[in-house]
């Protein structure tokens, strides 16, 4: 077959080819930020000629053009400046209201490099209607100016802009407009991952929050974010595998779907996951009717087995057939469970469609969506039972209109997105499901998104101050108890002056709590082995502090999961009947276990906990420490089996002031405390300028750095004695 010519450069940009210069290969142009390619792509035809999708005239030279944002077409009851036909990247538009009207939304908006305005639609409202003035987004025209119950407004976009959101909205009895705000956007615009992740995540969390048959919510509360521990969710993942998706992109689709599956199983809800890949025909890799669809490892393995070559004989994009296979699955499940049963009616359904283009065969996908809505009996009362997320990737041949038509429309939520590339998709799925905003005491949740603060990443982390100076660190293990090190308390038992500083979303300095009660392990005595030539001994270096008040759970304050508890068992998704030994085997399951602790400046630092034979060689180094242990004959006199050991190779060493802080691991997007920082042979902070400066030990240092952490699996009897009525412990 002939190959296509190679004279396809774009001035100021680059291009990629999905299948080289061969027929069927898709050439995709990209430009630096703030510019967009025109045309966006070309397809190599079997004749050996390049064709530009959607183009009517002959092949023109590809160029990078400046991105612009749409201008307001009309702005009611106020004025905007400057008045331009469209706005350059970085350009601002400002809004002011006439007397008697109050500005809602953003008074100043800036054009972003993706062709989208930042902020929110500015509206001048006098509060006269049953519903608030729905406003007119930039570039849109609205018909309908009455905002009473039952009134409707319609929107269209000017010139060549594309409408996403609802083209028609109705003022509902609860004073809220139906559907979702319409936005007019340039056909070449796309969404930034940092905008999509929270939008998608909020909507998804809402939907998960509703996954609870016993929960009654007032309609006016909207869909409250509240992850519950019961109810059932069917999640259908649809992955486009058509010709225009390169094999590498398909791998990222798979990886993103795996992230999603991993994350969804980290929620404490019952979930079944279906996996469908599609091109000209759909292929069901996992059905919700299969019991394995409830098992994360099985779902992930069916995803891993998804093969790009499965669809090489039919390379079109048949989105209708993919959605129809979801409909058929639902139909079978309904027949199986019985149409009238609660078991069927209380299942929530979420469909995530990952595609890179418009459907080009099999009929309108909207028809399949209509069938799905019908079988699930979706009406205003049951609107929460179905969410369809349509995610276009690649901004080349993605059809905004089609995505918008497929995505659900819910007030204050978005369900249709276009991302620049598969890397952006991966980023979104990494950060979208953020449980950290929950107000209940769900444990071990940290915000992992790139723009989260240190305290949001490790919200269990607290600072302990005896007077003015910070001394030690600790970890919230419930809303009123902190776990820390005993050696922090060496002034007898007067803790009236001590304070515990806990994260607080309202203040970057946190919030101070008094200590109601300090429970210091009676076994701790730093001088216990002085007569054996062991000048400092840290066995039983553990303490619990009961705070004078309960901590309000937030993004900045939340307990970490303690292994061997039911709370941790749920987070690990382990079966009921699991034991403490099972948790130890799952969490400390290698010779070298990657773990973390929190530095003085709040950042998360990495260590490796040495287990088994590696523990022995890790601890052995202590014999070289002649000052603290002048005549040590047996290392185990100092490093008992109560300690975990780290500090080899590239590990960071904790500073003295980091004592008592959690040593923790991440599993399934949740965090588990396995130890607490106790003592070490090297202090990287000693004499430093401030909390941000740490010195690495010179390679020649004798003894080399080693750090020892109290192993919580070895402190179970003591923990159970004092926390038995606070946490639910598993059998040993």
């Amino acid at each position: 077959a002939p190959s296509c010519p190679q004279n396809v450069n774009i001035s100021g940009g680059t291009f990629t080819l999905s299948h080289g210069w061969a027929p069927g290969s898709l050439l995709t142009y990209s430009c630096p930020q703030g510019l967009y390619p025109s045309p966006a792509s070309r397809l190599c035809k079997s004749s050996g000629q390049w064709q530009t999708p959607g183009a009517t005239r002959s092949l023109s030279k590809a160029v990078c053009k400046p991105v612009r944002c749409p201008a307001p077409v009309s702005f009611e009851n106020g004025i905007y400046t400057p008045r331009l036909g469209s706005y350059p990247v970085g350009g601002n538009v400002s809004f002011e209201c006439e007397d008697g009207f109050i500005l809602r939304g953003s008074p100043v908006r800036q054009c972003r490099p993706n062709g989208m305005w930042d902020g929110e639609t500015a509206v001048c409202d006098n509060g006269a209607g049953h519903c608030p003035n729905p406003g007119i987004s930039l570039g849109a025209v609205r018909t309908g100016f009455r905002f009473g119950h039952g009134d409707k407004v319609r929107y269209r976009c000017s010139s060549n802009l594309v409408l996403t959101g609802s083209s028609e909205r109705e003022c509902q009895g609860n004073g809220v407009w139906s559907g979702t705000e319409p936005i007019c956007r340039q056909p070449y615009s796309y969404d930034f991952p940092e905008d999509v992740a929270p939008a998608l995540g909020t909507s998804f969390s809402h939907m998960l929050g509703a996954t609870n048959p016993t929960q009654k919510t007032k309609e006016s509360l909207g869909r409250k974010i509240q992850i519950q521990r019961s109810g059932h969710l069917n999640l259908y993942l649809l992955l486009d595998c058509s010709q225009s998706v390169s094999e590498n992109d398909f791998l990222i689709f798979k990886e993103s779907a795996s992230l999603m599956v991993d994350r969804i199983f980290s929620f404490e809800i019952n979930v079944s996951v279906a996996i469908i890949t599609f091109a000209s025909e759909p292929k069901v890799l996992m059905s919700v009717l299969n019991d394995n669809s409830r098992d994360m490892t099985e779902v992930i393995s069916s995803l891993e087995n998804a093969n790009y070559k499965d669809h090489e004989n039919g390379t079109g994009t048949n989105t209708y057939a993919a959605l129809n296979s979801v409909y058929l699955m639902m139909n079978n499940q309904m027949r199986l469970l019985g149409m009238e049963t609660m078991a069927w009616q209380e299942i929530r359904h979420a469909i995530i469609l990952l595609t890179d283009g418009k459907s080009n065969m099999g009929g309108s996908p909207k028809t399949a969506v209509d069938h799905i809505r019908e079988i699930l009996n979706i009406n205003q009362k049951r609107n929460d039972y179905l969410d369809i997320y349509a995610i276009g990737v690649g901004k080349l041949d993605v059809d905004w209109r089609e995505l918008n038509e497929l995505g659900s429309k819910k007030d204050g939520e978005r369900h249709a997105f276009i991302l620049q590339d598969t890397k952006a998709l991966h980023q979104v799925f990494e950060h979208m499901l953020d449980v950290s905003k929950l107000t209940d005491t769900i444990c071990g949740v940290g915000n992992m998104s790139a723009n989260a603060s240190d305290q949001e990443r490790t919200p269990w982390h607290v600072t302990i101050k005896p007077k003015s100076q910070e001394t030690c660190r600790g970890a919230l293990i419930s809303d009123q108890w902190v776990l820390t090190a005993a050696h922090c308390f060496r002034d007898g038992n007067d803790h009236s002056l001590w304070r515990v500083n806990v994260g607080d979303p309202k203040s970057q300095w946190g919030k101070e709590f008094l200590i109601e009660k300090a429970v210091i392990s009676p076994g701790f005595d730093v001088f216990a082995k002085k007569n054996q030539g062991i000048l400092e001994f840290y066995g039983d270096d553990i303490a619990l502090l009961k705070l004078a008040q309960k901590v309000k759970m937030s993004t900045h304050a939340r307990p970490i999961c303690l292994p061997c508890t039911m709370e941790a068992n749920l987070a690990l998704r382990r079966p009921q009947g699991s034991t403490c030994r099972d948790h130890e085997n799952e969490l400390l399951n290698k010779q070298s276990v990657p773990a973390h602790f929190v530095a003085l400046n709040g950042s998360k630092l990495n260590i490796n906990l040495k287990m088994g034979v590696e523990w022995t060689s890790c601890a052995e180094v202590v014999s070289q420490e002649k000052t603290m242990f002048p005549n040590l004959t047996d290392v185990r006199e100092v490093v008992t089996d109560q300690f975990l050991c780290s500090g080899t190779q590239e590990d960071e060493s904790p500073c003295k002031g980091e004592s008592g802080g959690a040593v923790f691991l991440e599993r399934r997007f949740r965090f588990f405390q396995v130890g607490l920082v106790s003592w070490g042979l090297y202090n990287p902070c000693l004499g430093s300028a401030d909390k941000n400066s740490r010195k690495r030990a010179p390679r020649s240092k004798v003894p080399p750095p080693r750090d020892f952490h109290i192993n919580l699996f070895r402190m179970q009897p003591w923990l159970r004695q004092h926390l038995g009525d606070v946490l639910n412990f598993l059998p040993l």
């Epitope: 100076q469 060496r490 603290m628 003295k656 002031g657 000693l686 300028a689 401030d690 909390k691």
Partner: nanobody, 122 residues
Framework: QVQLVESGGGLVQPGGSLRLSCSAS????????MGWFRQAPGKEREFVAS????????EYADSVKGRFTISRDNSKNTVYLQMNSLRAEDTAVYYC???????????????WGQGTLVTVSS
Amino acid sequence: QVQLVESGGGLVQPGGSLRLSCSASGHTFRSYYMGWFRQAPGKEREFVASISWTGGSTEYADSVKGRFTISRDNSKNTVYLQMNSLRAEDTAVYYCAADYSGDFLLSDLDSWGQGTLVTVSS
């Protein structure tokens, strides 16, 4: 907070010895890590040595290791710095410091003495 007063500084020849003392007021002395810092004219204040609240562990800057020894006597609320084999570059004002955590971060230290001058010169 602990009040600290240094003494023992003076003029000494290269190769000579000197013993600095730092006396602390306050019944909580035994709970604090104690340390010595020094500041040469026109230079930053730098860490010299520290001793743990137990007296069981000591730390030294590489530049003084093997020549200086830090010790404490909790019954006298005093910490000492024995300086041997003194060199011209040891010339500085020596400060005593108390720190509850043991990190001796310069930005956080609030218990300092007024300093004692050590001059090493022939």
